[in-house]
Interface confidence: low
């Protein structure tokens, strides 16, 4: 009789993670007898994997009733395949032996292939704001892909970007890789409503990346400018001096007017209004009792946005000519209801 | 952009022998398990044969000992060598990339293949 | 080998009209199955992979069921562009065959 062979079919076996992968196994004889085992691996180090005599494998099923007498199918399913199942296996059949069964016959090995997702791309800014025309970095990452080829793109509002570089790890075979994007951004005044995408495509997402983004709003500091106006009022001893803080993001703004360098009053921004870009105007105005200064009052608007060094803008303020004869510039706006008396 | 380009058809004389090519860009061939199939004149598809990630092949039983599938990685190029070719290989072929879960989603756009004399 | 046998290989139907297509597997494939749309002088296009699952952009009015050797493809409201060429193809173990194709005509 022809001596016993064992048959592994498949030479390779591709299973997405997550999945059950069947690794087929048959003998063309029940001679000699004694027991079939599955090893991943080959040589001293190799990894049991199922053994038909003993042991528990929660993982492993076999396809056929291997308690059946004339049985010759040695197939096994492997179930929740994840990336570190990624190897060879080995069907090996064992004859029966005294005190211990002997190695008999080894299957040529069928290698398992493991397809895993990469995980959902996380960007991240800079930890600290910046203004426009300054660049700024963004990291993007993912992990937990097989295989390690893979596609990384970065775009701005939908436009691709190319200054970037890409790592994926490690350099050599593992099991499962990891990606690391740095992309460089010029910031504009109109980034605020602007978004930042990484974009990785890999085999197992059938055509369908998968994205992680980062708002600018969350990077860029707009500051403000500034434009200190006055217009008469009915009162003939009164002028509105208006301060207009024009454009800035983020909305945290403190303004301090200031009377010939003493400071007056201090006030956050509160009721802005957006403009389209998602920057924010705001204004605040001072009604200011002229007949009771007899030289010329040098007002200052003093504003420190987010933390920053203050800008100001000054105004003089003549108290020898008539009210009414001041040039003056109609308020854009009148957001802030600020009175203040000077006697 | 992921795509596949075959090239290599033409006019062959019964006997003779072709060797076809799929040039792959946007990914790396030796990555995927890559396919070639024909299609012969008002035919149906017919599975020719498959290289996987570690190199080994498997072939339909009519092309076994007369077609080989090899692949360039430095190329990022796949083969099929044709020999002893009959009137009946005449057909349109076609390289096809594997999905990871099953089936090919990436396909060339074919090459002729005339076999005659 | 595994064969694969498709019917019907003609089918005539209008606009609007529940479709379905069977595939047959000489042996067990559990769901290693797909199926593919032709048309004339274009490479395949990938609808259905592991017998039920809608591959990347295509129409939900296509759906595939089956596992083991019986297998379907159902587009429940055809529409002018379905007028094709479709085949089921096997890739369990090392074997990749199609089904002879179904022609899905205008009645």
């Known amino acids: 009789e022809e001596e016993l062979q064992v048959i592994q079919p498949d030479k390779s076996v591709l299973v997405a993670a997550g999945e059950t992968a069947t690794l087929r196994c048959t003998a063309t004889s029940l001679i000699p007898v004694g027991p079939i085992q599955w090893f991943r691996g080959a040589g001293p180090g190799r990894e049991l994997i199922y053994n038909q005599k003993e042991g528990h494998f929660p993982r492993v099923t076999t396809v056929s009733d291997l308690t059946k007498r004339n049985n010759m199918d040695f197939s096994i399913r492997i179930g929740n395949i994840t990336p570190a199942d990624a190897g060879t296996y080995y069907c090996v059949k064992f004859r029966k032996g005294s005190p211990d069964d002997v190695e008999f016959k080894s299957g040529a090995g069928t290698e398992l292939s493991v397809r895993a997702k990469p995980s959902a791309p996380v960007v991240s800014g800079p930890a600290a704001r910046a203004t426009p025309q300054h660049t700024v970095s963004f990291t993007c990452e993912s992990h937990g892909f097989s295989p390690r080829d893979i596609t990384l793109k970065w775009f701005k509002n939908g436009n691709e970007l190319s200054d970037f570089q890409t790592n994926v790890d490690p350099v050599g075979e593992s099991v499962s890789y990891s990606i690391h994007s740095t992309a460089k951004v010029v910031l504009t005044r109109e980034d605020v409503h602007s978004q930042v995408i990484c974009e990785v495509a890999h085999v197992t997402l059938q055509g369908d990346p998968l994205r992680g983004t980062a708002n600018l709003s969350e990077t860029i500091r707009v500051p403000p400018t500034l434009e200190v106006t006055q217009q008469p009022v009915r009162a003939e001893n009164q002028v509105n001096v208006t301060c207009q803080v024009r454009k800035f993001y983020p909305q945290r703004l403190q303004l301090t007017w200031l009377e010939n360098g003493n400071v007056s009053r201090t006030e956050t921004a509160s009721t802005v209004t957006e403009n389209k870009d998602g920057t924010y105007n705001w204004m605040s105005w001072l009604l200011v009792n002229v007949s009771a200064h007899r030289d010329d009052v040098k007002l200052t608007c003093q504003v420190e946005h987010d933390g920053q060094p203050a800008v100001s803008k000054s105004h003089d303020l003549k108290v020898s000519a008539h009210p009414k004869e001041q040039g003056s510039n109609t308020a854009a706006e009148n957001t802030g209801s600020n009175e203040r008396n000077i006697y | 952009e992921v795509q596949l380009v075959e090239s290599g058809g033409g006019l062959v004389q019964p006997g003779g022998s072709l060797r076809l090519s799929c040039a792959a860009s946007?990914?790396?061939?030796?990555?995927?398990?890559m396919i070639w199939v024909r299609q012969a004149p008002g035919k149906g598809l017919e599975w020719v044969g498959i290289i996987y990630v570690s190199r080994s092949t498997h072939y339909a039983s009519w092309a076994k000992g007369r077609f080989t599938i090899s692949r360039d990685n430095s190329k990022n190029t796949l083969y099929l060598q044709m020999n002893s070719l009959r009137a009946e290989d005449t057909a349109v072929y076609y390289c096809?990339?594997?999905?990871?879960?099953?089936?090919?989603?990436?396909w060339g756009q074919g090459t002729l293949v005339t076999v005659s004399s | 080998d595994i064969q694969m046998t498709q019917s019907p290989s003609t089918l005539s139907a209008s606009v609007g009209d529940r479709v379905t297509i069977t595939c047959q597997a000489s042996h067990n494939i559990y769901s290693n199955l797909a199926w593919y749309q032709q048309k004339p002088g274009k490479a395949p296009k990938l609808l259905i992979y592991?017998?039920?699952k809608l591959a990347s952009g295509v129409p939900s009015r296509f759906s595939g069921s089956g596992s083991g050797t019986e297998f379907t493809l159902t587009i429940s409201s055809l529409q002018p562009d379905d007028f094709a060429t479709y085949y089921c193809q096997s890739y369990y173990g090392n074997s990749y065959p199609f089904g002879g194709g179904t022609k899905v005509e205008i009645k």
């Open positions: 592991d017998a039920s």
């Open positions: 946007g990914f790396s061939l030796s990555n995927y398990e």
């Open positions: 096809g990339r594997y999905l990871a879960s099953g089936g090919f989603n990436i």
